[in-house]
């Protein structure tokens, strides 16, 4: 008998090279093989459970950056007046959540913020839990 | 043939809003669906393997906080003279281990320490390994 | 019918108590049960996917330490002029990658660097993906 294989784990790595003041960061998924999807600049959550979240990047100017998952809820990450980020976190997310950025700069100009090495990784930690597609 | 499902991963999120000087933090599990259990203010480890551990909280006064898993062993986390914590770690735990807090404050009063956003998450990283219930 | 079991997850914990200037750290795996292997002072990657990486240690002198996975690629971790490390990261690694250290000290003497609590943990986060042995 063939031993059971793991169904693919829900995970995604998105990159971002540009963020817009008072808005968010433009995210793209470099791989077509990702098990999670990007839609309207947000990562769509289909499966309930804990997620390991890694966020990295170097910014062209000082900014405040938050990573949200649900309207009316506090952010997953919140960084104030930083020029770089290299953070890891764990959060419980659920079907219908959407992970997206909010960015504000402290300059009066409304220029785009350039990002070097901008990367956001989400990895589901509770396979076997509830999913809806 | 139906593809195999993952058995549930051992994981838990506990909250704590109060710690007692020279003792620990009073932990409660907000969900009845957790795959791990709390007993005598400790999280019970049933499965051997690596665990992802996330610890967060804001404290009402400066304290030293350690997270232990076994008598006679060093702590998983140890924070000295802090008013907040936001840490992630990886540790190897085994059946019969118990994860619990120890807290000491530097004030002469023996008042309880209030905690805002106190959260401890454990997620097993080696499903398929030894478990005993 | 017996519920399916998880095949073992690719993971390893290696220890290091000594590093050599201009070279790397001498790594040993304390357990024979590891699902990943050490060869020529490197951890061999057999499975594609995200890896959770934990790196800890206290060093006997100030050093710069990098953790590499592929020739011609940037490091997984890079720490400059540190006496200790306690870092967690997530990285995408693939079959044929090898995880190894590079260390340089800033002293003129070529002393061995003693390490206390030197530990590197890798845990595969995408079981079910491509592996080659």
């Amino acid at each position: 008998q063939v031993p059971p294989q793991y169904p693919p784990i829900q995970s995604i790595r998105v990159q971002f090279t540009r963020c817009e003041n008072e808005k968010g960061c433009i995210i793209t998924s470099p791989s077509k093989d990702e098990t999670m999807k990007v839609q309207d600049n947000s990562i769509i959550i289909n499966c309930d459970g804990f997620y390991l979240i890694s966020l990295k990047g170097y910014f062209s100017e000082e900014l405040s950056l938050s990573l949200y998952y649900r309207k009316g809820r506090g952010p997953l990450f919140s960084l104030s007046k930083v020029t770089s980020v290299d953070s890891i976190g764990v959060a419980y997310l659920a079907f219908k959540d959407k992970v997206y950025f909010n960015v504000t700069t402290h300059s009066t100009s409304y220029k785009d913020i350039q990002v070097n090495g901008g990367e956001l990784i989400l990895i589901h930690q509770n396979p076997g839990g509830f999913c809806a597609y | 043939q139906v593809p195999p499902q993952y058995p549930p991963i051992q994981s838990i999120r506990v909250q704590f809003t109060r710690c007692e000087n020279e003792k620990g933090c009073i932990i409660t599990s907000p969900s009845k669906d957790e795959t791990m259990k709390v007993q005598d203010n400790s999280i019970i480890i049933n499965c051997d393997g690596f665990y992802l551990i996330s610890l967060k909280g804001y404290f009402s006064e400066e304290l030293s906080l350690s997270l232990y898993y076994r008598k006679g062993r060093g702590p998983l986390f140890s924070l000295s003279k802090v008013t907040s914590v936001d840490s992630i770690g990886v540790a190897y735990l085994a059946f019969k281990d118990k994860v619990y807090f120890n807290v000491t404050t530097h004030s002469t009063s023996y008042k309880d320490i209030q905690v805002n956003g106190g959260e401890l998450i454990l997620i097993h990283q080696n499903p398929g390994g030894f478990c005993a219930y | 019918q017996v519920p399916p079991q998880y095949p073992p997850i690719q993971s390893i914990r290696v220890q290091f108590t000594r590093c050599e200037n201009e070279k790397g750290c001498i790594i040993t795996s304390p357990s024979k049960d590891e699902t990943m292997k050490v060869q020529d002072n490197s951890i061999i990657i057999n499975c594609d996917g995200f890896y959770l990486i934990s790196l800890k240690g206290y060093f006997s002198e100030e050093l710069s330490l990098s953790l590499y996975y592929r020739k011609g690629r940037g490091p997984l971790f890079s720490l400059s002029k540190v006496t200790s490390v306690d870092s967690i990261g997530v990285a995408y690694l693939a079959f044929k990658d090898k995880v190894y250290f590079n260390v340089t000290t800033h002293s003129t003497s070529y002393k061995d660097i003693q390490v206390n609590g030197g530990e590197l943990i890798l845990i595969h986060q995408n079981p079910g993906g491509f592996c080659a042995y």
Epitope: - | G74, S80 | K56, T83, K111
Partner: antibody, heavy 120, light 107 residues
């Protein structure tokens, strides 16, 4: 002025237990790795146990592994050595010592010692 | 495990120079400390990191370390220097290894 003051030494029967303490002052205790070193009567110095500044990593000499436990309370500037299953050859003066900064395993500041006698 | 070899005793004439050696495999690749202990007293570090003197230690004490031998030199030995001297290194992480000790006698 750096001071390390040990206490808890006593006469104890074989198989018994003792807990040694070492209170530190005159330096920032929580930033220093610490050791216990012992000296049997008429003999040389022998390293016993080591603990990193945050208490997370500990190391022991083979002769005491599984019997002794080193720990620390950074809030109280105190180092401990819990000694169980004591044997006659554990009889010694026990010194607590703080590492020289950046030289791991190099006891630098020493206490005056506390005498542990294991005898029936 | 790592071993350090010291002579059990060294004699020196008052005012002359004493050399105490400490042998170990490639000891030059490790930092050496020298510790002085007077009878019934706590140990005191007199040399750290091969050749550095802590504050308050007289200049007559000096250290060197290369190859397989580290040396403690006492230039112009005084009667008060009569004591036991231990060399020490850190090995395999943080295992502090001590030599057997050398008894210095000032004649």
């Amino acid at each position: 002025e750096v001071q390390l003051v040990e206490s808890g030494g006593d006469l104890v029967k074989p198989g018994g237990s003792l807990r040694l303490s070492c209170v530190a002052s005159g330096f920032t205790f929580r930033t220093y790795h610490m050791s216990w070193v012992r000296q049997a009567p008429g003999k040389g110095l022998q390293w016993v146990a080591y603990i990193t500044r945050d208490g997370i990593s500990t190391t022991y000499t083979d002769a005491v592994k599984g019997r002794f436990t080193i720990s620390r309370d950074n809030a109280k500037n105190t180092l401990f050595l819990q000694m169980n299953s004591l044997r006659a050859d554990d009889t010694a003066v026990y010194y607590c010592a703080s590492d020289l900064v950046l030289v791991l395993g190099a006891p630098f500041y020493w206490g005056q010692g506390t005498l542990v006698t294991v005898s029936s | 495990s790592y071993e350090l070899t010291q002579p059990p005793s060294v004699n020196v004439t008052l005012g002359e120079t004493a050399h105490i050696t400490c042998g170990g495999d490639s000891i030059g690749r490790k930092y050496v400390q020298w510790i002085q202990q007077n009878p019934g007293q706590a140990p005191v570090v007199i040399i750290y990191k091969d050749s550095n003197r802590p504050t308050g230690i007289p200049e007559r004490f000096s250290g060197a370390n290369s190859g397989n031998t580290a040396t403690l030199t006492i230039s112009g030995a005084l009667a008060e220097d009569e004591a036991d001297y231990y060399c020490q290194v850190g090995d395999s992480g943080t295992k502090a290894v001590f030599g057997e000790g050398t008894q210095l006698t000032v004649l």
